[in-house]
């Protein structure tokens, strides 16, 4: 019956395992009159045969490593051998079995590594090959370090990338390797196929000898540089040295200072280029970089620390032109009147900024001089001799000398004698009642006015009132501003109100003076007031936990894979339904309940990454309010694009007849990501039959040369098939065709009689 093993002539692909003796036919093609027989051409290798009646079979075991794909053509012929149907392409894909063991390219490798090299940076590659298919486990190699000699404290200093064979230092190796202690190491490396995951995997081993060399690329000790240097600049302050000559040095100012006063020469000597000012900047941290001749960094940058040493170049300064203090009439001896805090820009906690205070003059000297004293180092003023009388002298002026070890400055203090603070503030109301506000009331709104009065001397610290909320507002949502002229208090909203966390707040205010109360007088219930704040609910939209959610997946993830998730909460506690907006490529779906995002179609990095969609969170019930956030899906590249020609190569021609073998250059590309080193394509002719006439040779990772092998070509178009392999994991291969015309030329251009043919080639070789 027609079906799996028989049917009409049409393009077909068959997969056959290598190494198996033939056990059944491949296919039975059925002829349609006038076809009576079939013809098989292409890469038969004398293995594939078609019988007259269309029976396609193979006569011996296949070997994928000899040929992984047999490109055959089958044509139906009439009795005269004339093609009446086809030829159609028949592709035999030879499936791999694990019949080849991996082999290291060398039985011994030698390499060297500098101490303190960056962990994970390869300094040596071991390389094994396995003729089996790298797209299957049979050819997937897994490298391992079997042993490290010597092994100190059971710590591995070396690691190997089990896929690439790249050997690098571990973090411990970077820190501890020291040629003075141990200048050489030996590693035994194994490679297994089957990705190292099977008991039946084949393996090979190799030996690696590693020499540890000294690393002189080290950060110098921190430098101290005295400020305001008068020596001629630039002044060498330190140096760095790369391990080999010829490095190009530069400094990097990470702080992006408007003035960067350092430079480096090509010996690695570092200079300060102008005097420094500690008070402008007391320390600099910058980086020294060594690059190769192409401007590529040779290693990590070194951190250079410069500390600017202080000199005493700043006098003390007064806090203000006149500092005003108040003292009550009956204050006792020794009471603190206030503290004069002068400043010195020189370095804190050094002799250069250590200040002394001394009273040099008191006016008036009534009833006597020396009524006040100042603590020499703290600057605190105290009442020294007796209580003061406002009616005798309501104001005193002091001149105070503030000095560091080299400079002196005079500061001025005014002391006002005020009435005693024997009256407490009294609220006009003890209860301001209830106030109902919506939770979305604006910040800064005044919601209540409160008033207390104080019978002490007006416009002094004894009568000034400060209002504090002492209860009912632990979140600090409210504040009280005082009008200094009227002592009126204005209650304002400082932070958003929230029905969900505080629907009712019982607020208690306290009114107090900045001046202390006289001995025996205490604040009582009159200085307290209360009010009740009731907050009403406003339906608010759900809130996402992030403005932007980001996830990263490989572009080849299986359909249905979870690629990320988003979360939102509704302030009112309603359930949330999630949806997607702007999924223009139809790649994603979101679980309405959990916010988990899944792929529903094949992803493609080459179509654009990151892929940006919006996620919408909507209240279930209520007002159905919704919020929007962003979901960014970063797609990591896999090798899923076969190489192709970088441009259109129609119109290539050689002038016929060829006087000597000629050649032309073509370029390949593919759409996958090529970090760092770019593509590394390999090129070969697309079929064995082309090898008599053409050869292809690699120029670099992207370009190759197609050359003629002789000069005896017919005057016609030849289509040259070229196989381009990208060497990726898995490797992908593209077969491209270069049409090359051999034609009569006039003045170096292809000549065709008028009306003879269209599409005249335009590029001569």
């Amino acid at each position: 019956q027609e079906g799996k093993f028989s049917g009409p002539l049409k393009p077909m692909t068959f997969s056959i395992y290598e190494g198996q003796e033939p056990s059944q036919i491949i296919f039975q093609f059925k002829a349609n009159p006038p076809a009576v027989t079939f013809e098989l051409t292409g890469e038969t290798d004398n293995i594939f045969v078609i019988e007259r009646e269309g029976l396609l079979y193979y006569n011996r075991a296949l070997d994928r490593e000899t040929r992984s794909t047999h490109n055959l053509q089958v044509a139906a012929l009439d009795a005269n051998g004339i093609i009446v149907e086809g030829p159609v392409p028949i592709t035999i894909k030879v499936k791999d079995i694990n019949d080849n063991r991996p082999t290291f390219l060398q039985s011994k490798y030698e390499g060297s590594v500098r101490q303190n090299s960056r962990p994970g940076k390869p300094f040596l590659y071991v390389n094994a090959t396995d003729l089996d298919d790298p797209a299957t486990p049979n050819g997937q190699l897994y490298y391992q370090i079997v042993i490290q000699l010597p092994m100190i404290n059971n710590v591995m200093y070396f690691q190997i990338n089990n896929k690439t064979g790249a050997i690098s230092l571990t973090r411990e190796g970077s820190q501890e390797l020291n040629p003075a202690k141990n200048p050489s190491y030996n590693l035994v490396i194994s490679v297994k196929d089957m990705g190292g995951q099977s008991e039946n995997s084949f393996s090979d081993t190799t030996s690696v000898d590693i020499i540890v060399t000294e690393n002189i690329w080290k950060a110098p000790k921190p430098v101290e540089m005295v400020e305001n240097s008068t020596d001629p600049h630039p002044i060498k302050i330190t140096q760095v040295r790369w391990n080999d000559p010829g490095a190009q040095y530069s400094l990097v100012d990470k702080e992006k200072l408007p003035r960067f006063p350092f430079s480096i020469d090509q010996e690695g000597d570092i200079y300060v280029t102008q005097p420094l000012d500690r008070e402008e900047k007391d320390a600099y941290v910058f980086y020294a970089v060594a690059k190769d001749e192409y401007g590529k960094p040779l290693s990590y940058p070194l951190e250079i620390h410069v500390k600017v040493k202080d000199i005493n170049d700043n006098p003390p300064t007064c806090p203000s032109p006149v500092t005003v203090f108040e003292v009550q009439e009956n204050e006792r001896l020794g009471n603190s009147i206030g503290t004069l805090t002068a400043h010195d820009r020189d370095e804190e906690n050094t002799a250069n900024s250590f200040l002394n205070y001394r009273i040099v003059e008191q006016t008036p000297k009534l009833p006597m001089d020396g009524l006040f004293l100042i603590q020499t180092y703290a600057g605190m003023l105290q009442l020294a001799k007796q209580s003061l009388k406002k009616q005798d002298t309501p104001q005193y002026n002091l001149t105070i000398e503030v000095s560091d070890k080299d400079f002196k400055t005079l500061c001025f203090v005014q002391i006002n004698v005020i009435d005693i603070n024997d009256q407490i503030p009294i609220f006009e109301k003890s209860d301001y009642g209830n106030l109902t506000l919506a939770e979305d009331t604006n910040i800064g709104s005044t919601i209540l006015t409160i008033q207390a009065t104080d019978a002490d001397e007006p416009f002094t610290g004894s009568s000034k009132i400060l209002y504090h909320i002492i209860k009912g507002d632990s979140e600090g949502r409210l504040g009280v501003d005082t009008d200094p002229h009227t002592n009126t208090g204005y209650v304002i909203i400082k932070k958003p109100l929230d029905f969900e966390t505080a629907a009712v707040s019982n607020i208690v205010f306290k009114a107090e003076n900045p001046e202390p109360l006289v001995f025996g007088v205490k604040y009582n219930a009159s200085s307290f007031a209360k009010f009740t704040l009731i907050v009403t609910d406003v339906n608010e939209a759900p809130q996402f936990s992030q403005h932007v959610f980001q996830a990263k997946v490989s572009e080849d993830v299986a359909i249905g894979t979870k690629v990320g998730n988003v979360t939102a909460k509704d302030p009112e506690g309603l359930d949330i339904s999630y949806s997607l907006r702007g999924d223009t490529r139809g790649w994603l779906k979101i679980d309405h309940v959990t916010g988990e995002i899944f792929s529903v179609a094949p992803l493609d990095r080459e179509a654009g990454s990151p892929y940006r969609v919006q996620v919408v969170a909507t209240e279930v019930g209520g007002s159905s309010l919704s919020s929007v956030s962003e979901f960014h899906l970063i797609l990591m590249d896999v090798n899923d694009n076969p190489p192709r020609l970088a441009k259109d190569y129609t119109g290539l021609f050689f002038c016929h007849p060829l006087s000597a073998p000629g050649s032309l250059i073509f370029e390949a590309t593919d759409d996958d990501q090529h970090l760092f080193r770019g593509p590394h394509f390999t090129f070969s002719l697309g079929s064995g039959s082309l090898q008599n006439d053409w050869e292809v040779s690699k120029i670099n990772g992207t370009h190759a040369r197609l050359s003629t092998r002789h000069t005896e070509f017919e005057e016609r178009e030849y289509v040259v098939l070229i196989r381009i392999n990208d060497g990726g994991r898995p490797p992908l291969e593209g077969i491209v065709s270069l049409p090359v015309t051999f034609c009569s030329c006039v003045e170096g251009s292809c000549f065709r009689p008028a009306g003879h043919q269209t599409g005249i080639p335009t590029v001569g070789m």
Partner: antibody, heavy 123, light 113 residues
Amino acid sequence: EVQLQQSVAELVKPGASVKMSCKVSGYTLTDHTIHWMKQRPEQGLEWIGYIYPRDGITGYNEKFKGKATLTADTSSSTAYMQLNSLTSEDSAVYFCARWGYSYRNYAYYYDYWGQGTTLTVSS
Amino acid sequence: DIVMSQSPSSLAVSVGEKVTMSCKSSQSLLHSSNQKNYLAWYQQKPGQSPKVLIYWASTRESGVPDRFTGSGSGTDFTLTITSVKSEDLAVYYCQQYYSYPWTFGGGTRLEIK
């Protein structure tokens, strides 16, 4: 040695029919197609058609359909061409020839010819 | 039908001379699948049946002297006899087997001076 032996001459009246033969030897008749050609004096060759004796498949030049009928007898290793409703225009030398192609033998040309049968149509 | 045109219809040359004769087809005889030209050359000596010289436009049949060469592609073909001998006196036919009905050219008669 491969040979194709044709009847030497035929003399027939206008309106009559003639069946000329081509006997092969030295190979199996069913392996190759037999083709027939017409050649008038001082003129070129015209292809009449072919027969594949293995399964009796025939192919004709549209010009000779209804005029010529090709058959084969594998038991006697002989191919035949019958011409009917003869006129003077049919007077010519008729050649049979073996087409060289066969399964696994890719000779795309007439490799063996008969010596020709001279047909004269005259009243 | 594909029309085959041969020229010249006759020519006379001396022994030892080089001869070229042309055959043109009304459409291309080059098959895209195998890049072969479906054309043969035959020689018919007086009183004899035709005999193949060249097939696939340029492949010489075994036993045919190498002074006979076929060339050309597509629609233009040439038979060249590099050094004519007296036994080459004959009519030369080209024939296409690209599509049915197969057709022959009118022939080129080669005479010896």
